[in-house]
């Protein structure tokens, strides 16, 4: 806490500029008007203030806006954002995607801090859902963002947002998350033709039920083994040998290399030996 002292003669700040880096903490407190600071926040980042000086500037903004900063100030916080606590951020009402991007940029390349997590949480709650533009932005900064959300949180993702999801965004998702995302993807891509649909839906198939796999088997999709191995075991088990053969197309030969691994192993054990023999792969049920 900085003591209230009168500003020395001639030191009253007329604008936020480089001369302020030579001010002691008490001088910044006494000589910089909070309203001036708020209107010229965009200049703060260009000036090499010390951490202690930034503390004073934050204190001035806190006094001016005890109920939380307005978005016009938040958007230009820059490195001052790193001084904010999650409690500070919970007072904010951030509605602009540009503001979100500006603050994420400050933290770019670093793990998600509690401040950023709170900011994102406030932003998404304010919007009511994780819309496409927001998801696009968040996964650009945090490729694992989607897979760090709970199935309950993912259920608020509208199908239209699924268009923003790239295959790599799903790399770390678990089966429960894919169970939630798959039906949304199916809805989002439903008007695409067969081969284009398969390219888009492929990353989500870890959440697909048996009947959808059966439908895909009728579309000459040639699923690769890596995708097949990520399918739900309970969804694969009811498939017939003919359906798996159609689903995998030329990749069906890869079953031999995976015969000891789930879901292939469990599927093999469910099939009649006569049917397995039609594949000519030497699979033993």
């Amino acid at each position: 806490e900085v003591e209230k002292t009168a500003c020395p003669s001639g030191k009253k700040a007329r604008e936020i500029d480089e001369s302020l880096i030579f001010y002691k903490k008490w001088e910044l407190e006494a000589c910089v008007d909070a309203a001036l600071l708020a209107t010229q926040m965009d200049r703060v980042n260009a000036i090499p203030f010390t951490y202690e000086q930034l503390d004073v500037l934050k204190h001035k903004l806190d006094e001016l806006y005890p109920q939380g900063y307005p978005e016009s100030v938040i958007q230009h916080l820059g490195y001052l954002f790193l001084k904010m606590s999650p409690e500070d951020i919970r007072k904010w009402n951030v509605t602009s995607l540009e503001t979100l991007k500006a603050l994420l940029e400050v933290n770019k390349g670093h793990e998600m801090s509690p401040q950023v997590a709170t900011l994102i949480d406030r932003f998404v709650k304010g919007r009511g859902q994780l819309d496409k533009d927001t998801l696009d932005t968040l996964t650009a900064f945090y490729p694992g963002y989607l897979c760090s959300l709970s199935p309950e949180e993912l259920s608020s993702v509208p199908p239209s947002s699924i268009w923003a999801v790239r295959p790599q965004d799903l790399d770390t998702c678990d089966p429960r998350q894919l169970d939630v995302l798959y039906p949304k993807a199916r809805l989002a891509f439903q008007n695409m033709n067969g081969s284009e649909y398969f390219v888009k839906i492929q990353s989500f198939l870890g959440g697909a039920p048996t009947e959808d796999l059966k439908a895909l088997s009728q579309q000459n999709v040639s699923m690769d083994l890596a995708t097949f191995m990520k399918l739900r075991t309970d969804a694969v088990l009811p498939l017939t040998v003919a359906e798996v053969q159609k689903l995998l197309g030329p990749h069906v030969e890869g079953l031999k290399a995976e015969e000891r691994h789930r879901p292939v192993r469990d599927w093999i054990l469910r099939q009649r030996q006569d049917d397995l023999d039609t594949l000519g792969l030497g699979l033993q049920g």
Epitope: Y142, D169, D171
Partner: nanobody, 116 residues
Framework: QVHLVESGGGSVQAGGSLRLSCAAS????????MRWYRQAPGNEREFVSA???????SYADSVRGRFTISRDSALNTVFLQMSGLKPEDTATYYC??????????WGQGTQVTVSS
């Protein structure tokens, strides 16, 4: 440097209980999605349970109602309470931490053996 260390495994009779721990350093269990996977001999690693950043949880169908995942932010540790254990739960159990950046870290595993 990220380090995950599992402990609490061991041998138990069917119907018994064990509590696995995953102590994390270099990552915060609150800011990461924390998951347990298991791998039985000759099998792929399979998902067991997860605790997401929000604190909500999920489970594989095979363990739901028997296993409970929890975390202690002060200890920076995630737990897996396993009860009603079955022989088919025999496996090496691995702790996984996934960051919003998409980085994934694994522990070295702890062995659980359930005899009938």
């Amino acid at each position: 440097q990220v380090h995950l260390v599992e402990s609490g495994g061991g041998s138990v009779q069917a119907g018994g209980s064990l509590r696995l721990s995953c102590a994390a350093s270099g990552v915060s269990v609150v800011n990461f999605a924390m998951r347990w996977y298991r791998q039985a001999p000759g099998n792929e690693r399979e998902f067991v349970s997860a605790m997401y950043r929000s604190g909500s949880t999920s489970y594989a169908d095979s363990v739901r109602g028997r296993f409970t995942i929890s975390r202690d932010s002060a200890l920076n540790t995630v737990f897996l309470q396993m009860s009603g254990l079955k022989p088919e739960d025999t496996a090496t159990y691995y702790c996984q931490a996934t960051s919003p950046m998409g980085d994934t870290y694994w522990g070295q595993g702890t062995q659980v053996t359930v005899s009938s």
